[in-house]
């Protein structure tokens, strides 16, 4: 006989994303004996809620519990049993939530209680069900990328650990309801609001974050279908051959386009509307989203809101990922430049439908937007956050790092785990295996 | 209100072309819809054919994409189907429909439903020798 | 293509009774978040009339006691209570994905 040596025994935590348009569980898991390791938490699963986002549930709030309990079931049979009790689970809602809660606040306590009380019907150690901030969710989707690509620390081959002189990445992320930029800067913030102060194993960072609420993919969708409606009577965005028929009510239920409303409107009444494949239209129609006006900083990025040049390399997710791999996968065009970009959205938008189609067999579903969704990434990347060719060169777009999904989940439930200390790690003695 | 009609020979020989026409009444053709045929076999299965566009454009179910053809005259408010090389498995009920994307909201998230609202009474093919 | 299984092939309810109708599709007709799934009612020598569109949003001019449910694969229409003028064959259908299919039906008979 021999000894063999086990296995560590591993951790696990569990994020329930409840976004916009639908929700997300993400497990996560590490080594029990390596908790303050950096880059030694990866996920473990995942699995899609079916249906909406949880604040499509507002009428029926026990149905957004409801629709957890298939991937709550897949938890189950994921984790290991006797890990269960000790395996923390959170549930963190973001826009649409925070919109829901705008308009409707008894609505959203209704949801996240009708949440809350499935959740603790699970062995999980539940510790809550919230709306996260737009700050939280710009600053968590930063921790993840740049935990995920060890940014923060690392360990070297002389057994020390050392911070990188790569520096961390900052992070873009366009959600349904509301799009986050995030990045460190050396100066500090002229909006105190806009800056976060973090300390990671030792090191400090000045981190700058703002997140737009109502320029999230789907809201920029539906405020443009608003625009093109009051000034064209049709959608320049849309292919033509395209054709809807839309419900008003549908179109002003949100909070994003309450200022785009008519004054006396039918909101039962159907109104026609075609596409028109105008790319130029298209940009002028999504150039109204961004108001350049009055800054009452040394310098903003749109709607008066203030931000520092962007500077170094940035990670992309969500929306934007989804939106340049259409670009580059479906319809196999170059966006390495923002000149690319540009010239990728307009291609797409001097598409037929038809043409649209027969490039894209099969899909069918919001097939229609991806003009729009194109150039408004084009436009909110290079008019709205002021990236240059320079600088969108150090842009990356990706849904992955180490096989994790990009996003704030793993960066959530990092914090409220304290699974990155603020003291930096001392050098460590142990035995090699090897 | 909108209507539609099927119209044409209710016997066809096997290997021959089949040709129907649908007549629309109360809607222009070029204004909007998308014209759809869809035919019912006899044990009541459904089959969505093709259908061209207000614009003129078309879209076949790639099953029938060979032997399918739908075409349209504006000037009568007409739209046709010829199915050609037809065999007894092309017996079937054959209706004419408009159909439109019904943009609906889910969440806070706007999509765009496909449904077939406008139908034809239908008119019966059978193909035999 | 996506195949649309109903259960049952057929079934008889009594009148002011719950009807209820089962689609099973053989992949997800769920895109961003929405259900691309739609149902039709055909009474004999008829043609099929949309009912339900999205999974659940009823078409305007159709009785609440229709009602449908559902996302992913799984998806369900409620007739309740059953009226004699709801005896006919109901087919659930798919937009998610080109080409648009149809289940094979479900005929419901008023006892």
């Known amino acids: 006989t021999r000894d063999v040596r086990e296995p560590p025994a591993l951790k696990y935590g569990i994020v329930l994303d409840a976004g916009s348009s639908h929700t997300s569980m993400f497990i996560y898991k590490w080594p029990a004996d390596k908790e303050n390791d950096t880059g030694i938490v990866g996920q473990h699963s995942s699995c899609d809620v079916p249906g909406g986002g949880i604040s499509s549930y507002a009428d029926n709030p026990s149905g957004a519990s409801q629709s957890l309990v298939g991937c709550l079931e897949q938890a189950l049979q994921d984790v290991p049993k006797e890990r269960h009790a000790g395996t923390p689970l959170y549930l963190g809602a973001t826009a649409g939530m925070r919109l829901l809660n705008l308009t409707n606040p008894e609505a959203s306590t209704s949801v996240l209680m009708a949440v809350t009380h499935t959740l603790t019907q699970y062995p999980f150690d539940f510790r809550g069900a919230r709306i996260l901030s737009g700050q939280e969710e710009g600053v968590f989707g930063w921790v993840t990328a740049n935990y995920l690509l060890e940014n923060f620390i690392k360990y070297g081959w002389v057994g020390r650990w050392f911070r990188p002189r790569k520096g961390t990445l900052g992070a873009m992320d366009l959600g349904g309801a509301s799009t986050q930029i995030t990045f460190e800067t050396t100066s500090p913030a002229e909006d105190r609001a806009s800056e976060v102060q973090l300390h990671l194993y030792g090191q400090h960072y000045r981190v700058y974050t703002h997140s737009f609420l109502c320029y999230g993919r789907d809201q920029v969708l539906q405020r443009l279908l608003a625009s093109a409606l009051q000034t064209h009577g049709f959608h320049p965005c849309w292919p033509r051959g395209f054709s809807t028929q839309v419900l008003l009510g549908d179109v002003y239920q949100s909070p994003c386009t309450m200022a785009q409303r008519p004054q006396n409107f039918n909101s039962s009444a159907r109104v026609s509307l075609s596409g028109s494949s105008d790319p130029h239209l298209c940009r002028d129609l999504v150039s109204g989203l961004f108001s350049f006006s009055s800054c009452p900083f040394s310098r903003c990025s749109f709607n008066g809101v203030f931000q520092p040049p962007v500077a170094g390399n940035f990670v992309a997710f969500s929306a934007f990922f989804y939106t340049v791999d259409f670009l580059r996968t479906s319809m196999g065009l170059p966006v390495a430049t923002l000149q690319q970009l540009e010239a990728a959205a307009v291609n797409v938008c001097n598409q037929t439908w038809a043409q649209l189609q027969a490039r894209v067999p099969g899909q069918r579903a919001r097939l229609a937007d991806y003009c729009a969704g194109a150039m408004f990434v084009q436009q909110l990347l290079s008019r709205g956050y002021g990236f240059d060719e320079r600088a969108f060169g150090g842009v990356i777009f990706q849904k992955k790092a180490a096989d994790t999904a990009v996003g704030w989940a793993l960066g959530y439930m990092l914090n409220l785990t304290n699974l990155i200390p603020a003291d930096p790690p001392g050098l460590r003695k142990g035995t090699d295996f090897s | 209100d909108i209507q539609l009609q099927e119209s044409g020979p209710g016997l066809v020989k096997p290997s021959q072309s089949l040709s129907l026409t649908c007549s629309v009444t109360g809607y222009s053709i070029t204004s909007g819809y998308y014209w759809n045929w869809i035919r019912q076999f006899p044990g009541n299965k459904l089959e969505w054919m093709g259908y061209?566009?207000?614009?003129?454009?078309?879209n076949y179910n790639p099953s029938l994409k060979n032997r399918i053809s739908i075409t349209r005259d504006t000037s009568k408010n007409q739209f046709f189907l010829k199915l050609s090389s037809v065999t007894t498995e092309d017996t079937a009920t054959y209706y004419c429909?408009?159909?439109?994307?019904?943009?609906?909201?889910?969440?806070?998230?706007?999509?765009?439903?496909?449904?077939?609202?406008?139908w034809g009474q239908g008119t019966s093919v059978t193909v035999s020798s | 293509d996506t195949v649309l299984t109903q259960s049952p092939a057929s079934l008889a309810v009594s009148l002011g009774q719950r009807a209820t109708i089962s689609c099973k599709a053989s992949?997800?007709?769920?895109?961003?978040?929405?259900?691309?799934m739609n149902w039709y009612q055909q009474k004999p020598g008829q043609p099929p009339k949309l009912l339900i569109y999205a999974a659940s949003n009823l078409e305007s001019g159709i009785p609440a006691r229709f009602s449908g449910s559902g996302s992913g694969t799984d998806f369900t229409l409620n007739i309740h209570p059953v009226e004699e003028e709801d005896a006919a064959t109901y087919y659930c259908?798919?937009?998610?994905?080109?080409?648009?299919?149809f289940g094979g039906g479900t005929k419901l008979e008023i006892k």
């Open positions: 429909a408009g159909g439109y994307y019904r943009y609906g909201l889910g969440s806070y998230s706007g999509s765009y439903y496909y449904v077939m609202d406008y």
């Open positions: 992949q997800s007709v769920d895109y961003d978040g929405n259900s691309y």
């Open positions: 061209i566009s207000y614009d003129g454009d078309n």
């Open positions: 259908q798919q937009s998610n994905e080109d080409p648009p299919t």
